[in-house]
Every structure is written in C-alpha cells, then in structure tokens.
Amino acid sequence: ARNGDHCPLGPGRCCRLHTVRASLEDLGWADWVLSPREVQVTMCIGACPSQFRAANMHAQIKTSLHRLKPDTVPAPCCVPASYNPMVLIQKTDTGVSLQTYDDLLAKDCHCI
Amino acid sequence: ARNGDHCPLGPGRCCRLHTVRASLEDLGWADWVLSPREVQVTMCIGACPSQFRAANMHAQIKTSLHRLKPDTVPAPCCVPASYNPMVLIQKTDTGVSLQTYDDLLAKDCHCI
C-alpha cells in the first residue's frame, strides 16, 4: 500500500528521489571502475511522517509503535522501492569488462 | 553483498531483529482485528555503520556519500530483508475471516 503522497512537512521535505553527483573517488571506486568518471547517483532521502508512502503493513505498524515508544522504535525510513540498472566499465583480472549492476541507482522511494 | 556482521559499536547496537510487544490498541487495530489480542512484532532496529550488513551496491554508495556529505546524505537505514507471514482473525462486512499477511513481521534485517 503506497499511502499518501502529500507531505505534511512542506514541499520536498518528505521521502523522495534525490540526485547526488559523485566522482569515482567520492564513491571509493577509482581503483576498479574506469568509466563513467562521474555518476549522478539517485537516492532516497527525506522524512517519513505518519503513513507517508508506507511501503506495507510493517511500515504502518512501525509508525504506530514509533508514536507510542519513540525512544525504542524508530520512525519508518526512506529507502528505494525499486532500482534502475547501470553499466560500469571496470577493471578485471583479465582486462576490462562492461558490467550491468541492477541495484545501484534508486528508481523510486517508499517508507519502511 | 551482505557485508560484515561484526558490529563496531558494541554488541546489540547495530541493525538487528528486535521484538516489541504490542496490543491491538497500540497498533490501532482494535476496530478491525479480533485475534490475537497481542502481537510480538519483530522489527529491524539499530545503527548501520560503514558496510555493516550492506544490502547491496546502493547501500555501499550511501555509506561512502554519507561519510563525505553527512548533512546531505543520510547513513543507510536498518530495514527488513524479508518477512514472516502472520494470520489475523479480522472483522469483515460479512462477518469474520482468517487472513494471512505476508509483510507484517520482519524475518531478518539489512542496511540500505
């Protein structure tokens, strides 16, 4: 259940897709990735207020218990609901290869 | 890649499965669930230090970018890697039914 997409905290404050520009050095990949030199990393960032983009029943439970026991149970967290694949040109033992990674870039986000 | 399971913050401080006892009232379910009266909710709680139980490449990227830009990029978050099903006896329009929920109880945890 993808619950409400309306953010009660104000525009852009709740869980959503952000793009962060990162070099191979930033990512710690310079020793094994040849290309691209820079990646537009899409990731899920933002708050998860009550029922906002709740991924499932577990997220709804977490919201309820966080309200009751905020010191014990954390609020739901903004994480990828799905991913976009990306190809990297990388060094291998035998030379160079073009490799697809399926779990690198967030495609959309939910709270869990 | 499920990276290191050793918690550098000390025993039990990192992302792991916890059990939280909750009544139907706590969960906000009293109006539609008849049984059980109480649920042992298993959920994922704890810190996600560098590479601890990293779910995938995206989690590794998040760790690297959080280190560089802690105000912009949050640390990975402790969430369910899989779920255990649970049956609830619930009220319906026509009476009572026994219903299985697949996404209610966390089975194990990872950082993402």
């Epitope: 290309s35 990306m86 697809t100 | -």
Partner: antibody, heavy 121, light 107 residues
Framework: QVQLVQSGAEVKKPGASVKVSCKAS????????ISWVRQAPGQGLEWMGW????????FYAQKLQGRVTMTTDTSTSTAYMELRSLRSDDTAVYYC??????????????WGQGTLVTVSS | DIQMTQSPSSVSASVGDRVTITCRAS??????LAWYQQKPGKAPKLLIY???SLQSGVPSRFSGSGSGTDFTLTISSLQPEDFATYYC?????????FGGGTKVEIK
Amino acid sequence: QVQLVQSGAEVKKPGASVKVSCKASGYTFTNEGISWVRQAPGQGLEWMGWISAYTADTFYAQKLQGRVTMTTDTSTSTAYMELRSLRSDDTAVYYCARTRHDTSGLRFDYWGQGTLVTVSS
Amino acid sequence: DIQMTQSPSSVSASVGDRVTITCRASQGIDSWLAWYQQKPGKAPKLLIYAASSLQSGVPSRFSGSGSGTDFTLTISSLQPEDFATYYCQQVHSFPITFGGGTKVEIK
C-alpha cells in the same frame, strides 16, 4: 561545440602499419572514452575497441587483438589507433567516436569524419 | 559475443509512411541499445540511446522501444532526409556489436 577531427586518407601496402589520429575539442577529453569503428566498402559497422582517455585502459575486439593499439595524448586531446600487419581486408573507413557514458549507459554521440585506409599492393 | 540481427535488411517506402525497423539480440541486453543513421559518405549519427531516449537535436518522428532481446526503431512519418541506412548497437557488454543495417530506400 564537440568536434572530432581525423587525419587524412592513407594508402598502405600489405604488411605495413597505419596510425590514424583523432583530435577532440569542445569538451574535457579525459571525461569520456574513445571508441574506434571501421566500415569496409559497402559493408556494415565493426567496433574495433575502446580506450579510456583518463587511464588509457583499453579493450580490443578479439579479431584485432595483437595487431591494434589505441593510445591517447591528453596534452593535445588526441586519440590514436595503430593497425599493424595490414591486409587487403583491412581496407575500410576508420572512425573515432566519443563514447559518452552516464546513468543512461554508453553511446557514440560524436563521430570523426572518417579516415579511408586503402591496403593495396 | 552478442549477435544483433536487424530486419528487414532493406525497405522501400514513400514520404509520409510509417517505417518500423526491428533489432533482435542473441541474449538479453536490458535497455542497453542505441540506434544510428548513416548516409552515404558520412559518419553515423546517434538517434536513440538506452532503447528509447531521443538524442538531443533528433526530430521527434524517431522513436525507440523494447527491452531484453527485441527492439524497434519507428519513423512515424518518413521525410526525404530520412532515406539512409540504420544500425542498432548493443552496449550491454564488450565487445560492443552492431546489427547488419537496414537500408531505407525511396519507393
């Protein structure tokens, strides 16, 4: 604007070598790789290989392995492709192409004008 | 190596016609496919990348679709300047490979 300018046509004898240059302008040369593609008369496109303009790491098509060398000179933003032990079936137009790489994958978004290499005794 | 098979190898069409060219990969390549147009004596020109993304400056009558093994390039309304040879290219794994080409000729 991005431009790739290649060296002029060459006529070579069988067994000789040829070195084709490709001078890039209009972008940061080391940010993208260069691919080389050839096209025999009346035939389709054949990818020869790729070079990282940043690290100079290469991948060569298997059928050319041992005969081809791709290099770059970052000081002049120029890529080079040398083909040795030329045979008559190496007669082709040789193209360099900027190999753009980002989250949408790879594509050859700018091409040189082509260099005709004729191998004939 | 991944083989790319284009069909038809040639097609005769008139200005205003809708033209569809297909490309099949010998194994799954996700959406890592590009399309190029080449006119006689000229270098190829990028039209479509990532299977369906239109390269900047390319007219919107060109579109691409497909993923996995089967891909399509469509020219919605053929223009005089579109008579050329079209190539698909997989960029899923090295070695990069091209299809054999489809020549679009005037009927």
